[in-house]
């Protein structure tokens, strides 16, 4: 997260760290007791490593009573996701067992009504992604509030030049932005999950390259079918 600040500890009990061989790789969001939603491209970076999900964490390194690392029983990328595009960049991870819920571990309601978030709405994005252009990684969860940007502006030639489909949304990126390592994490508007950080190799913190988020409401049928 660029231009953000440390989050209040355990105030986002839905927040997950998707890890490979014990290292943070991507963000994720607990959407059901045994399911974490993340970004499909995160799996590409996992290679043949052991994928696990950390829940209940604020610090990645320090011991915390609520922290627990779960093995992944099943990884389900969206069937239409492709390595060369950010389309359908969603991944569902089934935990090896139901998460132990509590004040620091709780699923987040996700948007099912397929309607665009009003441009200008302030939404919260959180993650353990890099906090500087130099690539500094934080130990503790960071967050930032970002205004939603209308799709027409995001699609301008100076911005993402037509790449933003109806199934994506954008948020402003003027110095405050999601960045590398935040992919798969949640964009939360009014206490509801609206978007998942896409995992392209986008430049961060440049106002002409807004953050791109996969709209979960556009994938309600797929999410429901996997969770069923």
């Amino acid at each position: 997260i660029l231009g953000g600040r440390e989050a209040e500890a355990h105030a986002r009990p839905y927040m997950a760290s998707v890890q490979v061989n014990g290292e943070h790789l991507c963000g994720g969001v607990l959407v059901a007791e045994q399911w974490v939603l993340s970004a499909a491209h995160c799996l590409e970076d996992a290679a043949d490593g052991k994928v696990q999900v950390l829940l209940g964490a604020h610090s990645l390194s320090q011991p915390e009573p609520s922290k627990r690392l779960y093995d992944v029983l099943r990884a389900v990328p969206h069937p239409d996701s492709r390595p060369d595009t950010i389309d359908h960049d969603l991944l569902l991870l089934q935990l090896s067992e139901k998460a132990t819920l509590g004040p620091a571990v709780r699923p987040l309601p996700w948007q099912r009504v397929d309607r665009d978030v009003e441009p200008g709405t302030l939404c919260d994005v959180a993650g353990w992604g890099i906090v500087s252009h130099a690539g500094r990684r934080p130990d503790r969860l960071q967050h930032v509030l970002l205004p939603v940007l209308d799709r027409a502006t995001c699609n301008r030639r100076t911005h993402h030049d037509g790449a933003i489909t109806q199934r994506m949304m954008c948020a402003e990126s003027n110095r405050r932005d999601s960045c590398k390592g935040d992919s798969g994490g949640p964009l939360v508007c009014g206490g509801v999950l609206e978007g998942v950080v896409t995992s392209g190799s986008r430049v961060c913190g440049n106002r002409k390259k807004p953050g791109i988020y996969t709209r979960v409401a556009s994938y309600a049928a797929w999410i429901d079918s996997v969770l069923a």
Epitope: D150, R151, A152, N155, R157, H159, H160, G162, Q166
Partner: antibody, heavy 115, light 107 residues
Framework: EVQLVQSGAEVKKPGASVKVSCKAS????????MYWVRQAPGQGLEWIGE????????NFNEKFKSRATLTVDTSTSTAYLELSSLRSEDTAVYYC????????WGQGTLVTVSS | DIQMTQSPSSLSASVGDRVTITCKAS??????VAWFQQKPGKAPKGLIR???SRYSGVPSRFSGSGSGTDFTLTISSLQPEDFATYYC?????????FGQGTKVEIK
């Protein structure tokens, strides 16, 4: 297939107004700005302005700001350019074009201003 | 306003020739430059965006380069259907502005 279909040719008297339409199909109209360009006979291309169909926000070439009005009707996916206080120098082909992605342009509308 | 000065204003060339058209911006426009081809009585057709990216369907003989203030459109081997007028456009700053055009004619 993306298409921008413009209204037919117009002949107007000096001082009158003209309204040119541009009907979009084959994509989500509100997902892209629409801009307008004109080309006087034998001349180059001149940018008039643009509109965001989501918000109705417009940006204009200062030269046209006082006389041009850009609007959209999202229910019919149509963009409009209205130019008032016409003079003979406004005789030109007027084009709408989608801003972003592939460069889609309308076929052009010839507006002739003559007394 | 940013002036886009195109040169030459016209040129004569033969099929198979390599043709280069330049466009100079009066101030830095990064790589926010497009090139269009226009034939008589037709709407402009996009060739290049972001200074060097070809639009899909545009033959590989068309290439663009440059950043900042100096930009070039090159046609590596001129074909009969390439005889037309070419325009550069900057979209970095309002108002968007076009070069005055380069007419490519048959020698």
């Amino acid at each position: 297939e993306v298409q921008l279909v413009q209204s037919g040719a117009e002949v107007k008297k000096p001082g009158a107004s003209v309204k040119v339409s541009c009907k979009a199909s084959g994509y989500t109209f509100t997902s892209y700005y629409m801009y307008w360009v004109r080309q006087a006979p034998g001349q180059g291309l001149e940018w008039i302005g643009e509109i965001n169909p989501t918000s109705g926000e417009t940006n204009f070439n200062e030269k046209f700001k006082s006389r041009a009005t850009l609007t959209v009707d999202t229910s019919t996916s149509t963009a409009y350019l209205e130019l008032s206080s016409l003079r003979s120098e406004d005789t030109a082909v007027y084009y709408c074009a989608r801003e972003g992605g592939f460069a889609y342009w309308g076929q052009g509308t010839l507006v002739t201003v003559s007394s | 306003d940013i002036q886009m000065t195109q040169s030459p204003s016209s040129l004569s060339a033969s099929v198979g020739d390599r043709v280069t058209i330049t466009c100079k911006a009066s101030q830095n426009v990064d790589t926010d430059v497009a090139w269009f081809q226009q034939k008589p009585g037709k709407a402009p057709k996009g060739l290049i965006r972001s200074a060097s990216s070809r639009y899909s369907g545009v033959p590989s003989r068309f290439s663009g380069s440059g950043s900042g203030t100096d930009f070039t459109l090159t046609i590596s081997s001129l074909q009969p259907e390439d005889f037309a007028t070419y325009y550069c456009q900057q979209y970095n700053n309002y108002p968007l502005t076009f070069g005055q055009g380069t007419k490519v004619e048959i020698k």
